[in-house]
């Protein structure tokens, strides 16, 4: 009948604007870690970041400088 | 939606390990830098470790430095935290974190005698 | 070590206006240490307000937003309500832009 027509079309936009949000939702949550994530620089198209380089490079430099105080680069120069 | 939910949680002693657990859905787990943050009773929040997307790169709080690690398992949605010579001031609710963006609910971890 | 600074403790009368800073014992919060704020409510899990010094997280209102105010990141509450008496962290980077992370010790905030 024209009246159960109109209820399932009504039930089906419902349902399609429900599906639509729950999508656009779980987009921008989805998205929002990872957009916070490159807009920092840590993330390139889902590999690490340089910056993780620089970070390895310095633990690796400050262990080697670590092991003998003698060698340890002084930070102020006599005058 | 992002849920990330710790377990792992428990009552050990002194000098014990612990290995801490989040399982993480609701986005692209892989693409993303993961952190752990703790809270003692009572207390701020301290940022403990992270790690990067491959899991090659690892951060520590100089407080944790050599007892805790942290890893991950790209495969299986789950982020870890083993901690090995716990100490009372180790106690604290442990969350798991997309890099200080989403948030866990926390698990307890107890370090007593 | 890098000590993160905030107030203890604020008021705000409700309809009111409050801004909550977060500064560092040495050096400025600048834009690349990428400043964030986090609410804490008796009992929850901290939850994000703002990240990358001034985005705001979803879902949370625009009566939140952060800045750089001199050498401080900054979050403004603009017509404060009963509800939003909790306490505020900030944190930021400090390893270039990346870890490690530290965080403020915090802020107690009262809506009165």
């Known amino acids: 009948s024209e009246a159960e027509d109109a209820s399932l079309l009504s039930f089906m936009q419902g349902y399609m604007k429900h599906a639509t949000k729950t999508a656009k939702d779980a987009l921008s949550s989805v998205q929002e870690s990872q957009v916070a994530q490159q807009a920092r620089g840590w993330v390139t198209d889902g590999f690490s970041s340089l910056k993780d380089y620089w970070s390895t490079v310095k633990d690796k430099f400050s262990e080697f400088w670590d092991l003998d105080p003698e060698v340890r680069p002084t930070s102020a120069v006599a005058a | 939606e992002v849920q990330l939910v710790e377990s792992g949680g428990d009552l050990v002693q002194p000098g014990g390990s612990l290995r801490v657990s989040c399982a993480a859905s609701?986005?692209?787990?892989?693409?993303?830098?993961m952190s752990w943050v703790r809270q003692a009773p009572g207390k701020g929040l301290e940022w403990v470790s992270a790690?990067?997307?491959?899991?090659?790169?690892?951060y520590y709080a100089d407080s944790v430095k050599g007892r805790f690690t942290i890893s991950r398992d790209n495969a299986k949605n789950t982020l870890y935290l083993q901690m090995n010579s716990l100490k009372p001031e180790d106690t604290a609710h442990y969350y798991c974190t997309t890099g200080e963006v989403d948030w866990g609910k926390g698990t307890l971890v107890t370090v007593s005698s | 070590q890098t000590v993160v600074t905030q107030e203890p403790s604020l008021s705000v009368s409700p309809g009111g206006t409050v801004t909550l800073t977060c500064g560092l014992s040495s050096g400025s919060v600048t834009s690349v240490t990428y400043p964030g704020w986090y609410q804490q409510k008796p009992g929850q899990a901290p939850r994000t307000l703002i990240y990358n010094t001034n985005s705001r997280f979803s879902g949370v209102p625009n009566r939140f937003s952060g800045s750089i105010s001199g050498n401080k990141a900054a979050l403004t509450i603009t017509g404060a309500l009963p509800e939003d008496e909790a306490d505020y962290y900030c944190s930021v980077y400090i390893g270039g832009g990346i870890y490690p992370a530290v965080f403020g010790g915090g802020t107690h905030l009262t809506v009165l």
């Open positions: 790690i990067n997307t491959a899991g090659t790169v690892t």
């Open positions: 609701g986005l692209t787990f892989s693409n993303i830098y």
